[in-house]
């Protein structure tokens, strides 16, 4: 969490941002909140990006003002116009690109004063893994697949029964470049699995960590997966 203040004493307002991550090719949100004002027409929101000459987005007098918007953000940004009055300056960003990563500034002017806060935005690719029993294999084998990751993640297998065991000798992981030549499909195979055990396939890079669990018994197979973004810090 980053909390920024205006420069001059009583004419400063609090602006709060949260560091976040964007999934390339998907839509993202850059979070920013501020002390609200009574009149929408008195609020100015400017989003800026370090190293970019034009603005990322500008909202003033109750509407967007895109005359100074940088070409790389054309047609890709929006604020939640109906929520500005309650202090939400968050930015919706369409079709996140690797090049969108960097330091952003949320700069606010209201009748109470000015304030700003920076936000670190990471970009990459992350997706939920799915673990299945590979019935085509000669021995009991599990196959963990996740369609889109970048940068290249690490893959670690774990088991509920054999806690702390190292499965690197009995697993094989491959990375296949997707058609857009950036993200990769992750496939990891675990051999010699036993029934009545829960196995976890953990995929992690510096942006996200995802886990796919599978419990195999003689009567059923249960699956569960979850994904967590790393380093979401507020400012």
């Amino acid at each position: 969490l980053i909390i920024g203040f205006g420069i001059s004493g009583r004419h400063s307002i609090t602006v709060t941002t949260v560091a976040s991550a964007g999934n390339i090719g998907e839509d993202g949100i850059l979070s920013c909140t501020f002390e609200p004002d009574i009149k929408l027409s008195d609020i100015v929101i400017q989003w800026l990006k370090e190293g970019v000459i034009g603005l990322v987005h500008e909202f003033k007098e109750g509407k967007d003002e895109l005359s100074e918007q940088d070409e790389m953000f054309r047609g890709r940004t929006a604020v939640f116009a109906d929520q500005v009055i309650v202090g939400n300056a968050s930015l919706r960003l369409k079709n996140v690109q690797l090049t969108d990563a960097g330091t952003y500034k949320c700069y606010i002017i209201t009748s109470k004063g000015k304030g700003n806060a920076n936000l670190e935005y990471k970009t990459g690719a992350f997706s939920m893994p799915e673990v299945n029993v590979d019935y085509n294999a000669s021995s009991e084998t599990l196959r963990c697949e996740a369609p889109r990751w970048f940068p290249q993640p690490t893959v670690v297998w774990a088991s509920q029964v054999d806690q702390g065991a190292n499965f690197s000798e009995v697993s094989n992981t491959s990375f296949e470049l997707n058609s857009e030549n950036v993200t990769m499909k992750v496939v990891s195979v675990l051999y010699n699995v036993t029934i009545n055990n829960t196995y976890s396939c953990m995929i992690e890079n510096d942006i996200a960590k995802a886990t796919g669990d599978i419990k195999v018994t003689e009567s059923e197979i249960k699956r569960r997966s979850h994904l967590q973004l790393l380093n979401s810090k507020a400012s």
Epitope: K63, D64, L66, Q69, A78, K94, S179
Partner: antibody, heavy 120, light 107 residues
Framework: QLQLQESGPGLVKPSETLSLTCTVS??????????WGWIRQPPGKGLEWIGN???????YYNPSLKSRVTMSVDTSKNQFSLKLSSVTAADTAVYYC????????????WGQGTLVTVSS | EIVMTQSPATLSVSPGERATLSCRAS??????LAWYQQKPGQAPRLLIY???ARVTGIPARFSGSGSGTEFTLTISSLQSEDFAVYYC?????????FGGGTKVEIK
């Protein structure tokens, strides 16, 4: 409510320049949250996005037409214009102007469209 | 550019029946998709944006769903005024592109 109206010649000779103007009424072309776009539809076919312009004059064109397209805006007249050079019979279409959301980038409302035929 | 493919090209439905129109993108467009209705001699009219958000004034019988590459426009109970051509449009990346259209005709 906002209305758009295309105007311009209905017949253009091959190799010449097609020129159309869209007049916006019931609202200002300076509406900051919108671009102003052109879309065309050849007879009996689908829709093709030509490009858009912001009230400040910044433009974005469809790469397939970029070398031949020029758009301009006249805020004092609440109008924006399209020029398409070196036309051929393949450019025969109904040309629509429309308001385009800055994001989400929908088109609404549209002008009623004007048929431009390219023929000698 | 992203290619949008609509199916079927023609859909024959009786009034009061349900119509399901499909739109497929050549690559993921997230939920950055709009649907339009066009009647003969008229300009298209926006029905749905962001894949599922219905425009103010559009009847509730029109609904959109989907994300990524597969999208659906559903008309729950066709009225006589709904027989028209329907187009999907992606605005995920430039250039914006439209599908070839689905004509909904009276059976």
């Amino acid at each position: 409510q906002l209305q758009l109206q295309e105007s311009g010649p209905g017949l253009v000779k091959p190799s010449e320049t097609l020129s159309l103007t869209c007049t916006v009424s019931g609202g200002s072309i300076k509406s900051g949250s919108h671009y102003w776009g052109w879309i065309r539809q050849p007879p009996g076919k689908g829709l093709e996005w030509i490009g858009n312009i912001y009230y400040s004059g910044s433009t974005y064109y469809n790469p397939s037409l970029k070398s031949r397209v020029t758009m301009s805006v006249d805020t004092s007249k609440n109008q924006f214009s399209l020029k398409l050079s070196s036309v051929t019979a393949a450019d025969t279409a109904v040309y629509y102007c429309a308001r385009e959301g800055s994001y989400p980038n929908w088109f609404d409302p549209w002008g009623q469209g004007t048929l431009v035929t390219v023929s000698s | 550019e992203i290619v949008m493919t609509q199916s079927p090209a023609t859909l024959s439905v009786s009034p009061g029946e349900r119509a399901t129109l499909s739109c497929r993108a050549s690559q993921s467009v997230s939920t950055n998709l709009a649907w339009y209705q066009q009647k003969p001699g008229q300009a298209p009219r926006l029905l749905i944006y962001d894949a599922s958000a219905r425009v103010t004034g559009i009847p509730a019988r029109f609904s959109g769903s989907g994300s990524g590459t597969e999208f659906t426009l559903t008309i729950s109970s066709l009225q006589s005024e709904d027989f028209a051509v329907y187009y999907c449009q992606q605005y995920h990346s430039f250039p914006f592109t439209f599908g070839g259209g689905t004509k909904v005709e009276i059976k």
